[in-house]
């Protein structure tokens, strides 16, 4: 008799793919634009990325450092009207893109949470949650929670409001902290909270270090759902050299949890290449005319248009990974097992029951390496075959679909491999 199928876990929409942050509407849309009506016109692009949710804003009225002039129920007229927002919500729903609203109160000011008036601000947030839930948003984000006194209890209260309205609503909290203990203490009292942090931001050094960070995090958080990013708001290029961007895309899309990206991560948008542009929100490079301040700074291969036409581009890789992440059971909710593959490498298996399984091997180093995959580290339920088919490599030149002998696996510098193999009883 065939073995019984394992029961599928309950899956929320944010479990099924990536979230895409647009923290600065004006920078995202470019010169002379930057409103909700314009963003509506970019939803097809978001659909092409196969992202499941858009984390938007903040877009509320906020006069820098002035609580009285901060209204979480009102959209800043520079971004548009409530009607524009409703229209954006409707269009996004039609395209199966959920909208998460950032309600970080004092986003234009020095302290995001007006440190001296915590209770006033907390009440404003509570009212805002109820108002925007009624308006149809799918969730909320609050950032810089390390600046919020008694963050855990406030988050628990806001989580109750959000989940009380519907189990299908999400609360995301962001912190600049990279300290695991601080992160765990925030998670402890908030069961379904999705937390973005700087935990992985210094992981770029070696495969061993990244492996230990990831496994420590997963062990510490047990069976709760995680999110993966390098920070609560910033671009990957703020932390990574260009040669590691592909590797990190592959990793973030294949770890167990929700990958969270900032606009521009899909093309390797880098503020440092655009003199004068703010590190936290450089202008999005749609095409070569997107940065007219210094035209010579932008070449076609840095833009959405140029990369869309190149199957070997970072954007093309992002789209492929996003597609795989949203349709393969083993990547959607499969078990995770990291194992040794040799110095400089990080490797793991994702598997779910009798579904197709995935092997990820990442070379963080700047020299080519032979992978010594230590299958003995793996439980019987996740054993390695002799060969696996190459689904994709982060580097050009490999023949996709071809079977690779796992004992003879060699990786180029900064190369990541995604391999697939069938379940074997």
């Amino acid at each position: 008799r065939a073995p019984r199928c394992r029961e599928l876990p309950a899956q929320k929409w944010w479990h099924t793919g990536a979230l895409y942050r647009i923290g600065d509407l004006q920078a995202f849309q470019g010169h002379g634009a930057g409103n909700l009506a314009g963003l509506k016109g970019r939803l097809d692009y978001l659909s092409s990325l196969k992202v499941k949710g858009l984390v938007l804003g903040p877009i509320h009225k906020n006069q820098k450092d002035d609580v009285a002039q901060t209204d979480l129920l009102q959209i800043d007229p520079n971004f548009g009207s409530k009607e524009d927002f409703d229209s954006l919500l409707q269009s996004a729903k039609k395209k199966s893109i959920r909208v998460i609203l950032d309600l970080t109160p004092n986003y234009r000011g020095e302290n995001s949470w007006f440190s001296t008036q915590v209770d006033t601000v907390a009440t404003k947030v509570k009212d805002a949650l109820e108002f925007w839930l009624q308006a149809g948003v799918d969730g909320f984000q609050v950032r810089d929670i390390e600046n919020l006194k008694d963050a855990s209890s406030f988050l628990a209260e806001w989580q109750n409001i959000t989940k009380g309205f519907s189990e299908d609503r999400l609360l995301i909290a962001g912190t600049n902290s990279s300290d695991l203990q601080q992160i765990l203490s925030l998670l402890e009292s908030n069961k379904d909270l999705l937390l973005t942090s700087s935990y992985l931001s210094d992981s770029g050094s070696t495969g061993e270090h990244t492996k230990s960070l990831v496994t420590q995090y997963l062990n510490a958080t047990g069976n709760r759902w995680c999110s993966w990013s390098l920070s609560q708001a910033r671009l990957l290029t703020s932390f990574l050299p260009a040669q590691l961007l592909r590797l990190y895309q592959l990793m973030l899309f294949t770890l167990p949890g929700t990958p969270v990206f900032s606009y521009g991560d899909e093309i390797g948008l880098d503020a440092a290449a655009l003199p004068g542009q703010p590190m936290e929100a450089p202008v999005m490079l749609w095409d070569e005319s997107s940065f007219p301040d210094i035209p010579g700074a932008v070449s076609a291969n840095m833009t959405v248009k140029g990369q869309s036409e190149d199957p070997g581009s970072l954007l093309s890789l992002f789209r492929r990974l996003s597609d795989q992440r949203s349709k393969e059971r083993s990547l959607l909710h499969g078990d995770f097992h990291a194992f040794s593959a040799g110095p400089g490498l990080f490797s793991y298996i994702r598997h779910w029951d009798q579904n197709e399984r995935f092997l990820v091997v990442l070379n963080f180093g700047d020299v080519g390496l032979s992978a010594g995959l230590q299958a003995s580290d793996l439980p019987a339920s996740a054993s390695l075959p002799a060969k696996a088919d190459l689904l994709l490599s982060t580097q050009p030149g490999r023949e996709e679909g071809s079977p690779l002998e796992l004992e003879r696996l060699k990786l180029e510098p900064h190369e990541g491999l995604l391999l697939r193999f069938p379940y074997a009883a």
Epitope: H31, P275, G276, P278, P292, I294
Partner: antibody, heavy 125, light 113 residues
Amino acid sequence: QVQLVQSGAEVKKPGASVKVSCKASGYTFTSYYMHWVRQAPGQGLEWMGIINPSGGSTSYAQKFQGRVTMTRDTSTSTVYMELSSLRSEDTAVYYCARGYYDILTGSRPIFFDIWGQGTMVTVSS
Amino acid sequence: DIVMTQSPDSLAVSLGERATINCKSSQSVLYSSNNKNYLAWYQQKPGQPPKLLIYWASTRESGVPDRFSGSGSGTDFTLTISSLQAEDVAVYYCQQYYNTPITFGQGTRLEIK
């Protein structure tokens, strides 16, 4: 009126560092990018880099990478340029210069509508 | 880097006469998306900082006398002073802002004949 006022002349030994300040007044400090341009005695103009006073992001000419640091203090509307590991070839007048800003389009092309009076830095043993 | 070359290095012109300074860039500074030339001209008098005269190759900065005009496109540009005045004695620089590093011409010294 709009003006940029720079700190006074400096004499430094080779290997030392110099920090030049530039105080802006008469306009919204964070709305305009600031640049540093130097001019060696009897020579032409040489662009060193840019700072965005709003967020503090910087971009330096390759030639000065690793030796120059541009910072700003929004509370006093002042930008600073520090040049380290000085050598005799760094003897020059150092200017801060405000980048143009088109309020209508929001564009900031890099030409300079307001200049500081200049700071003479002499590097000599 | 874009190299800017001015000619002549120095120029002597009689009062009331026309003065012409040329500037050539090593690559085009015309941006096809907005059809603008990313070129500026400055005047620098002894002991003073440079002063902006012209930007976008031909737009005069406010307060600059209309005897100053700029022309040209692509790689070849000209600054013209239609009728030289005594106060125009200075060094003139062209500058490209099409790409970083921002670069200047070596300067043209203008004197009275």
